[in-house]
Interface confidence: low
Amino acid sequence: GSTVPPMVNVTCSEVSEGNITVTCRASSFYPRNITLTWRQDGVSLSHNTQQWGDVLPDGNGTYQTWVATRIRQGEEQRFTCYMEHSGNHGTHPVPSGNSHHHHHHHH
């Protein structure tokens, strides 16, 4: 089948004690094999500091998944979501300022 690149969306949600959860969602991609991971200062975080969702069908013949990690508020600029799918890859920053989500479609 044809390759459908993911739509990648990065969001932040506030949690307690000066920490926030940043979530990177990949949706509408095919085939289902994908790498999605958080990087700090350009290097992937260890597995035990990230939480992954299952790769699930989204009802359109494509798939969706997510990865999340907790970071200190004010340190958002150090973190990026790295995506690799069907030979294509991309890096997505955590939105800065008042913007709380960012999405981009890979071609």
Partner: antibody, heavy 118, light 108 residues
């Protein structure tokens, strides 16, 4: 073998600028950030900032934000650090380094001595 | 800014002796973000220990690291002639990334 090769020593006048290059090899240039650090004679290590070669994101130590400019040329896999409005206290060895696990500096260039003197 | 204070500034020891170097942080940092470097005269720093206690590639087993919170230690169990150098701790937990001022291990 991972190596970072820096440009040669420079002597500059106060008020001028200097641009130091750093050419890594032995790994994919865009896969790790490039850090810049300086060391004044007989002193400790001071972090200037870093650049993500893949997306061009730059993070500066606030102390250098107004005078340092970090850039990359992906076509030649080379990173650059330019420091403007030089003063005598900028005399130092300037190092580039590769980002490692948990924000450490895992490989270093050989250093570039920048001397600022009138 | 997290300030790292190393002590002592200079450590005068003989080959074969044990060296204990301290690094104290002005506020608590995760042990995952504390690293140690060795620098010899005229050379670039070299990563020695990462994440508090993990030896970097090629580093001899006589080096070890420990600590948590605000207090970290680098230990050299039995000094070899090539170990006389300056040692720096570094934190990567918060910006700006900072180094300690260094501890010089010199021959007594």
């Amino acid at each position: 073998e991972i190596q970072l090769v820096q440009s040669g020593a420079e002597v500059k006048k106060p008020g001028s600028s200097v641009k130091v290059s750093c050419k890594p090899s032995g790994y994919a240039f865009t896969s790790n950030n490039i850090y810049w650090v300086r060391q004044a004679p007989g002193q400790g290590l001071e972090w200037i900032g870093y650049i993500d070669p893949y997306i061009g994101r730059i993070i500066y130590n606030q102390q250098f934000k107004d005078r340092a400019t970090l850039t990359v040329d992906k076509s030649t896999s080379t990173a650059y650090m330019e420091l403007s409005s030089l003063r005598s206290e900028d005399t130092a060895v300037y190092y580039c380094s590769r980002s490692g696990e948990r924000s450490n500096f895992d490989y270093w260039g050989q250093g570039t001595l920048v001397t600022v003197s009138s | 800014e997290i300030v790292l204070t190393q002590s002592p500034a200079t450590l005068s020891l003989s080959p074969g002796e044990r060296a204990t170097l301290s690094c104290s942080a002005s506020s608590s940092i995760s042990s995952n973000y504390l690293h140690w470097y060795q620098q010899k005269p005229g050379q670039s720093p070299r990563l020695l220990i990462y994440r508090t206690s993990n030896l970097a590639s090629g580093v001899p087993a006589r080096f070890s690291g420990s600590g948590s919170g605000t207090d970290y230690t680098l230990t050299i169990s039995s000094l070899e002639p090539e170990d006389f150098a300056v040692y720096y701790c570094q934190q990567g937990g918060s910006l700006p990334l900072t180094f300690g001022q260094g501890t010089k291990v010199e021959i007594k």
